[in-house]
Interface confidence: medium
């Protein structure tokens, strides 16, 4: 699947319900500039943070030219959900759509976009809009990847040994240390698709007094440091 094109700007804004909103939709100026390009870009990979609101858009076809809009939603382990709208009779029809968080943005005769409010881990999947017009069918698909921010903790568990954990992240976080030590990393996979990464490091060199755990993740990076004490130190914890 193609990566998001730079012309499809990812807009993030704070709304008064305190959830960030993400959209790959374009304004009218962008529609005219990118019309042919967007129709060619059939599929877009789109990482979206859990608990935000997401808006997925159909191809930029004027609604006056529309006959039918269909959204197909394929989520892991569920039957395909279809939401359709027929302009002439102003009818909508849904099949196998049980998740009430996935809805039309407004009335489909006014806005063909689909919204997820809020995004949950179960919304990982493929979303496709098909617009039927007198000129043919136009498609736009999204491979939606739900990102979950891991909870990061750092603590000393034995003499000159520290443990850094990135708990329940999606995808798995990467852990690095400054300075480098003698490290072992384990990953624990959870049924909901999240991964806990645990890195345990030991420093023999006694002139190392402070160590930093750096956690890299698609939702953002986080660094925590700890002083290596002769006895186990206080536990540090942070969200990315």
């Amino acid at each position: 699947a193609a990566q998001p094109n730079n012309s499809l700007m990812l807009q993030t804004s704070k709304e008064n319900h305190a959830l960030a909103s993400s959209s790959l939709c374009m304004d009218e100026k962008q529609i005219t500039q990118n019309y042919s390009k967007v129709l060619a870009e059939v599929n877009t990979s789109w990482p979206v943070k859990m608990a935000t609101n997401a808006v997925l858009c159909c191809p930029p076809i004027a609604l006056r030219n529309l006959i039918i809009i269909t959204w197909e939603i394929i989520l892991r382990g569920q039957p395909s959900c279809t939401k359709a709208y027929r302009k002439e009779t102003n009818e909508t029809k849904e099949t196998n759509c049980t998740d009430e968080r996935i809805t039309w943005v407004s009335r489909p005769d006014q806005n063909s976009d689909l919204q997820i409010r809020p995004v949950a881990i179960t919304h990982d999947g493929y979303y496709r809009c098909i617009m039927v017009t007198p000129d043919g069918n136009f498609h736009r698909g999204y491979h939606l990847q739900v990102l979950v921010t891991p909870e990061v903790t750092l603590f000393q568990n034995r003499n000159r040994t520290a443990v850094c954990k990135a708990v329940a992240g999606k995808p798995a976080a990467q852990i690095s240390w400054i300075p480098e030590g003698d490290c072992a990393t384990k990953q624990e996979y959870w049924s909901n698709g999240t991964v806990t990464v645990k890195s345990t490091c030991h420093w023999e060199v006694h002139n190392v007094s402070t160590v930093t755990c750096h956690v890299s993740h698609l939702t953002g990076n986080k660094s925590l440091y700890i002083e290596l004490l002769p006895v186990p130190g206080a536990k540090k914890s942070a969200k990315l």
Epitope: I68, E88, E94
Partner: antibody
Framework: EVQLQQSGAEFVRPGASVKLSCTTS????????IHWVKQRPEQGLEWIGR????????KYAPKFQDKATITADTSSNTAYLQLSRLTSEDTAVYYC???????????????WGQGTSVTVSS | DVQITQSPSYLAASPGETITINCRAS??????LAWYQEKPGKTNKLLIY???TLQSGIPSRFSGSGSVTDFTLTISSLEPEDFAMYYC?????????FGGGTKLEIK
């Protein structure tokens, strides 16, 4: 194979009600729409209404709004037409038919039942 | 409601001939007109939808044309099994409405 099997002929008294059934096979009714059409003896076809079995939403022709009630049971793949306060004007053959719901093109009624004859007589 | 006027109401023809049946809508129905065949003892058959699209399994001697308000069903090289009742029907808006029907009989 797509089939719509309708219930048998009905002979009813004026003022009574009758409930006709349309059991489908070869497709899931919740994916489509089921329509009902009336045909009086030696006359043409009249559209009564339709149901979206997935959610129970119905639409009726104005003249049948107070006469007909369309329901569906997705577990048995069956649609129903209930006719109330029957008069001789309701003597007719009643057909159920399928309209494809979620397809790229909206079709009309692509499969029909064999019809149920309703005779209203005292 | 959209009124559908179908003509003629009766038509006599011989096998091998070509016939046309017309339907006129009281207002625009775009291309959303269907044609059906009704025969005693058989379930009604969809012949044409969207004005001109032949339904799967229907012989190519059946064809439909027209849009907006005026539509035509043409049956070329009539076969004995084509003698039946024919109805047009609009499905552009509710309530759906049918034409009065055309009875095609053998001359």
């Amino acid at each position: 194979e797509v089939q719509l099997q309708q219930s048998g002929a009905e002979f009813v008294r004026p003022g009574a009600s009758v409930k006709l059934s349309c059991t489908t096979s070869g497709f899931y009714i919740k994916d489509d729409y089921i329509h009902w059409v009336k045909q009086r003896p030696e006359q043409g076809l009249e559209w009564i209404g339709r149901i979206d079995p997935a959610n129970g939403n119905t639409k009726y022709a104005p003249k049948f709004q107070d006469k007909a009630t369309i329901t569906a049971d997705t577990s048995s793949n069956t649609a129903y037409l209930q006719l109330s306060r029957l008069t001789s004007e309701d003597t007719a053959v009643y057909y159920c038919a399928r309209q494809l719901g979620l397809r790229r093109t909206w079709y009309s009624l692509d499969y029909w039942g064999q019809g149920t004859s309703v005779t209203v007589s005292s | 409601d959209v009124q559908i006027t179908q003509s003629p109401s009766y038509l006599a023809a011989s096998p091998g001939e070509t016939i046309t049946i017309n339907c006129r809508a009281s207002k625009s129905i775009s291309k959303y007109l269907a044609w059906y065949q009704e025969k005693p003892g058989k379930t009604n058959k969809l012949l044409i939808y969207s004005g001109s699209t032949l339904q799967s399994g229907i012989p190519s001697r059946f064809s439909g044309s027209g849009s907006v308000t005026d539509f035509t069903l043409t049956i070329s090289s009539l076969e004995p099994e084509d003698f039946a009742m024919y109805y047009c029907q609009q499905y552009n808006e509710y309530p759906w409405t049918f034409g009065g029907g055309t009875k095609l009989e053998i001359k």
